[in-house]
Interface confidence: low
């Protein structure tokens, strides 16, 4: 098949692959009918004039993971059929003007993971058919006005992981077909009003891991097709009242890792499609009535690791489709009995690592589908009679690391726990904290006769009586907090991966799906 360089492999499908450290220049002669050429992991440092002159049928050219630092302006001459060009993972600092001239069919241009210091309007002025431009992982400090003006067909632009400190409001104005814009991991402190106004078809906007302190009220008002908005790990301390008002298609919004102190009613929405709202690691202290009431399709609400001490009874109004509610690691002391009343489809709730002293008997009254409840590491001494009776699907209940008061009032709870031991898991069981003579003993098998009797007459338990168990040897109370944690780590180079990870067998509330961007 028309000759294949010895350092390359050539398939009958006109695909050529050249790899290896011994390659220091573009191999020759390349088969004239090659349609795909990959030059990977070589020691090529420069591309000279027209090394691909005789393979004009080439459609895809990948020159990746090399030592490439210099390219002659005419390097890609005669590649008029080229649709895909990747120069990613090289050592390019400068692109010569006119490098992409004549590449009239080019649709994808990957320049990511180089050391580019600047781009100019003239670089891409000939690339009128370009649909994808990847510039992430470079050293760009600013984007000049006009840089993308000729790329009217562009649908995906990645500028993440650069050193951008500001963006001109005009730089994206001609990109009316853009669907994905990624600006994550830069040094942006604010985004001027109007920056995204021309992006009427935008579906994903990634702004996470910048230093944005303030969002302009109308920043997203023209982006009616936006589906994913990543604002996590910035310095946002407040949300303007109308900032999310015109996002009817949004289905994922990440705001974790900011400095939000309060959420005002109506701030979210109306967003008929929003499925996930990530708000952990902020400074939120209270949740007012109706704060999420516009989010009728919300399924995942993560509010953990804030400073929430008060939740208004109507805070979760409207969240009829919510499946997962994470409130762990906050400062809750009390909960209103009606606070979860509207959450008819809730399956998992995490309330661990708070300061809850008691729970109202009707707290889970309407939430019949609950499968997992995390209540460990609170200040609970007892629980109301029958609090879990109606929860037929409950398969996971964590109650350890609470100061259970094992007097005769604890009997109904102890009997219920005895019958439902599998739901408690085998790792850590709840133990008595008081009276002193039973401290450290398992709540489930404690002999309540040994404990100090309560002054009140206990109610008749609604659970069947269970046999008494003799005393068991005391063992130290384990006070280590084994809390559910949300970890964030990048997936590929543009993602908010938000995995709620579990440290024991709490896999149901482990939110096994990775929330990736």
């Amino acid at each position: 098949y028309h000759g294949c360089p010895s350092e390359c492999t050539c398939s009958r499908a006109s695909q050529v692959e050249c790899t290896g450290a011994r390659i220091v220049a573009v191999p020759t002669p390349l088969p004239w009918n090659a349609m795909s050429l990959q030059i990977l992991n070589t020691h090529i440092t420069e591309l000279n004039e027209s090394p691909f002159l005789n393979i004009s049928a080439l459609i895809a050219l990948r020159i990746e993971k090399n030592e490439l630092s210099r390219i002659t302006p005419g390097a890609f001459r005669n590649l008029g059929s080229l649709r895909y060009l990747s120069l990613a993972n090289n050592k390019l600092q400068v692109l010569p003007i006119g490098l992409f001239q004549g590449l009239d069919s080019l649709e994808s241009l990957l320049l990511s993971s180089n050391q580019l210091l600047q781009i100019q309007p003239a670089h891409f002025s000939q690339c009128s058919n370009l649909k994808e431009l990847q510039l992430h992982g470079n050293h760009l400090e600013y984007i000049p006005d006009g840089a993308f003006d000729h790329l009217v067909g562009l649908t995906k632009l990645n500028l993440g992981k650069n050193s951008l400190t500001h963006i001109s409001p005009r730089v994206f104005q001609h990109l009316g077909n853009l669907q994905v814009l990624r600006l994550y991991e830069n040094r942006l402190t604010d985004i001027p009003m109007g920056t995204f106004d021309g992006l009427v078809n935008l579906q994903e906007l990634a702004l996470q891991q910048n230093q944005i302190g303030l969002l302009s009220p109308g920043l997203f008002h023209n982006n009616h097709n936006l589906q994913r908005l990543y604002l996590s790990n910035n310095h946002i301390s407040q949300l303007p009242p109308s900032v999310f008002m015109q996002l009817p298609q949004l289905n994922r919004l990440t705001l974790f890792g900011n400095s939000l102190k309060e959420l005002s009613p109506g701030i979210f929405g109306p967003m008929p499609n929003l499925r996930e709202l990530w708000l952990y690691d902020n400074h939120i202290s209270s949740l007012p009535d109706n704060v999420f009431s516009n989010l009728r399709q919300l399924q995942v609400l993560i509010l953990s690791r804030n400073q929430i001490s008060f939740i208004s009874p109507g805070a979760f109004n409207g969240l009829t489709e919510l499946r997962e509610l994470s409130l762990h690691t906050n400062a809750l002391q009390d909960l209103d009995g009606n606070v979860f009343r509207m959450l008819a489809n809730l399956q998992n709730i995490s309330l661990q690592n708070n300061r809850l002293r008691q729970l109202p008997g009707n707290i889970f009254a309407n939430v019949n589908g609950l499968m997992a409840i995390q209540l460990q590491n609170n200040q609970l001494e007892n629980l109301p009679l029958g609090i879990f009776d109606h929860l037929g699907k409950l398969c996971e209940l964590r109650l350890y690391d609470n100061p259970w008061r094992c007097d005769s009032d604890i009997l109904p709870l102890r009997n219920w726990l005895l019958l439902n031991q599998p739901r408690l898991g085998t790792d850590t069981v709840p133990v008595c904290f008081s009276p002193a003579n039973v401290r450290g003993q398992s709540l489930i098998i404690i002999n309540v006769n040994v404990a100090v009797p309560s002054v009140h007459v206990p109610e008749v338990p609604s659970y069947p009586e269970t046999p008494w168990y003799p005393d068991t040897p005391s063992y130290p109370d384990t006070t280590s907090v084994s809390s559910t944690t949300e970890l964030t780590s990048p997936v590929e180079d543009y993602t908010d991966l938000t995995t709620i990870q579990v440290t024991d067998d709490r896999s149901v509330w482990g939110m096994t799906q990775a929330q990736s961007g």
Epitope: G218, H221, N222, H224, S242, M245, Q246, P248, Q249, P270, P272, N273, R296, Q297
Partner: antibody
Framework: QVQLVQSGAEVKKPGSSVKVSCKAS????????ISWVRQAPGQGLEWMGG????????NYAQKFQGRVTITADESTSTAYMELSSLRSEDTAVYYC????????????WGQGTLVTVSS | QSALTQPASVSGSPGQSITISCTGT?????????VSWYQQHPGKAPKLMIY???NRPSGVSNRFSGSKSGNTASLTISGLQAEDEADYYC???????????FGGGTKLTVL
């Protein structure tokens, strides 16, 4: 009680423009959305576009894009709909309607303005 | 042609129940719980009867109820009365170029 009062009937020549007003009273004007819906004689309802005065950015149905302009004046609690390049098939009753949000439902309607396009 | 499909007419006798259907796609009716129903008497502006599939605004009789299954929404009027005779329109939020789509309307005749 919320009320939407529209301007009076208009007769226009083909190719000209018409501007219909809708004055709101009895509620917060800025934070609600005003939509414009038209109804040709003997026909159904057709959404043209909407605006939330607080934001100022209108949204238009694709069919009317480029021909309709919707604006709002917060100081007078009045919304406007201007339709240009009129043709005979634009003869219709034009309603303004208020909703919590232009995507959802319209709980208050104006009385309607008949626009007749005839040469 | 309207984006949502309704029967052109339905009829019923006083006291009876009738149902008007409204069929769309997964981009409108099927995709969201944002279906509304309006009643319109001749020469009058439409009046909101049902919003968000099944909610009734205050002042609307509980004889009017709404539901949805898949891509089809329905309006049911029980205990038909003479004043129910009117045109009825369904409307949905739409994941398309138009944010709002209406049905073609159904003329209800009370016999």
């Amino acid at each position: 009680q919320v009320q939407l009062v529209q301007s009076g009937a208009e007769v226009k020549k083909p190719g000209s423009s018409v501007k219909v007003s809708c004055k709101a009273s009895g509620g917060t004007f800025s934070t609600y959305a005003i939509s414009w819906v038209r109804q040709a004689p003997g026909q159904g309802l057709e959404w043209m576009g909407g605006i939330t005065p607080m934001f100022g950015t209108p949204n238009y149905a694709q069919k009317f894009q480029g021909r309709v302009t919707i604006t709002a004046d917060e100081s007078t609690s009045t919304a406007y709909m201007e339709l240009s390049s009129l043709r005979s098939e634009d003869t219709a009753v034009y309603y303004c309607a208020r909703g919590d949000w232009y995507d959802y439902h319209f709980d208050y309607w104006g009385q309607g303005t008949l626009v007749t396009v005839s040469s | 042609q309207s984006a949502l499909t309704q029967p052109a007419s339905v009829s019923g006798s006083p006291g009876q129940s009738i149902t008007i259907s409204c069929t769309g796609t997964s981009s409108d009716v099927g995709g969201y719980n944002y279906v509304s129903w309006y009643q319109q008497h001749p020469g009058k502006a439409p009046k909101l009867m049902i919003y968000e599939v099944s909610n009734r605004p205050s002042g609307v009789s509980n004889r009017f109820s709404g539901s949805k299954s898949g891509n089809t929404a329905s309006l049911t009027i029980s205990g038909l009365q003479a004043e129910d005779e009117a045109d009825y329109y369904c409307q949905s939020y739409a994941n398309r170029d138009n944010f709002v789509v209406f049905g073609g309307g159904t003329k209800l005749t009370v016999l």
